[in-house]
């Protein structure tokens, strides 16, 4: 079972969904799951969701999370359920920022 | 409402290939989200998983029928289609297309073909 | 032949409960979560329970499914005569790298 592209894994996960991508669904089928933490307006964005090509989340997974934004990656049905991606603040928060889950 | 459709003849000859086509009515397919496949059904007998595709062009077949499958899909008819080649008697079914790559959410009603000379 | 195995029949009266089994291996049920499909006579078939134990909008609570080691089930609890149908069950497969399904079980009211 294979794609012009053989090394790839064509398995797909169920992934918890949650933000403006999902409409009216709370989960998702795709070959990643992913949660991630973005900084929008003052806001902490809080998404979670699924990557169904694979080129899109290998290269997003392998992103390393900067001040403004961060996305925690995984493989397994419903592994994203209790990820909740984190900034790389070391504890430290950026002011007037706000927590904010996209529904 | 979401609503899938096939469409195809009914009869095959042996040896030629069998067409069907997927037509998805209430969604659009390049928006992404969903996973599109076929599932065939012998019959009187279960069910057999042919392949998946998503709307960029990524596929994956059955590897017992991967070497005479293609599966494609047309965004601008928001339709995905079946191609199965050499066909025998052994590909008489009911054909059903159905939205999702594993856990298939939503079905067409199917369509039997018949390949006899 | 199915990669899933399931007992051809079942039956029970209305308000009875049935339970439907699916054995597997380790590279199918062992590893992954199971879906369960209903075909009503003449049509097509219908998710019932997907990720072993959930059911999509619409389906009524009197069907569960559980699953447990390279084994899967599905519960008809409070039987109806609109139950009867076929129902399969389903798993993504890591040897064959695929979804495969079980024979399938004739469910009967009596």
């Known amino acids: 079972m294979e794609d012009e592209k053989p090394k790839v894994n064509p398995k797909l996960y169920m992934c918890v969904c949650e933000g403006l991508s999902c409409g009216n669904e709370d989960h998702c089928e795709g070959q990643q799951c992913f949660s991630s933490l973005s900084i929008n307006d003052g806001f902490h964005v809080y998404q979670k969701g699924c990557f169904q090509v694979y080129e899109q989340g290998k290269m997003t997974c392998k992103t390393p999370p900067s001040p403004g934004q961060a996305v925690e990656c995984c493989q397994g049905d419903w592994c994203n359920r209790n990820i909740t991606a984190q900034l790389p603040t070391k504890g430290k928060s950026f002011p007037g920022t706000q927590n904010f889950h996209l529904e | 409402q979401v609503q899938l459709q096939e469409s195809g003849p009914g009869l095959v000859k042996p040896s030629q290939t069998l067409s069907l086509t997927c037509t998805v009515s209430g969604a659009s397919i390049s928006s992404g989200g969903y996973y599109w496949s076929w599932i065939r059904q012998h019959p009187g007998k279960g069910l057999e998983w042919i392949g998946y595709?998503?709307?960029?062009?990524?596929?994956y077949y059955n590897p017992s029928l991967k070497s005479r499958v293609t599966i494609s899909v047309d965004t601008s008819k928001n339709q995905f289609s079946l191609y199965l080649t050499s066909v025998t008697a052994a590909d008489t079914a009911v054909y059903h297309c159905?939205?999702?790559?594993?856990?298939?959410?939503?079905w067409g009603q199917g369509t039997l073909v018949t390949v006899s000379s | 032949s199915y990669e899933l195995t399931q007992p051809p029949s079942a039956s029970g009266t209305p308000g009875q409960k049935v339970t439907i089994s699916c054995s597997g291996s380790?590279?199918?049920?062992?590893?992954?979560?199971v879906n369960w499909y209903q075909q009503l006579p003449g049509t097509a078939p219908k998710l019932l329970i997907y990720?072993?134990?959930q059911r999509p909008s619409g389906v009524p609570d009197r069907f569960s499914g559980s699953k447990s080691g390279t084994s899967a089930s599905l519960a008809i609890s409070g039987l109806q005569s609109e139950d009867e149908a076929d129902y399969y069950c389903?798993?993504?497969?890591?040897?064959?790298?695929?979804?495969?399904f079980g024979g399938g079980t004739k469910v009967t009211v009596l």
């Open positions: 380790s590279s199918n049920i062992g590893s992954n979560t």
């Open positions: 159905a939205r999702g790559g594993v856990r298939f959410d939503l």
């Open positions: 595709s998503y709307y960029s062009g990524s596929t």
């Open positions: 990720s072993n134990n």
């Open positions: 389903a798993a993504w497969d890591d040897s064959l790298n695929g979804v495969v």
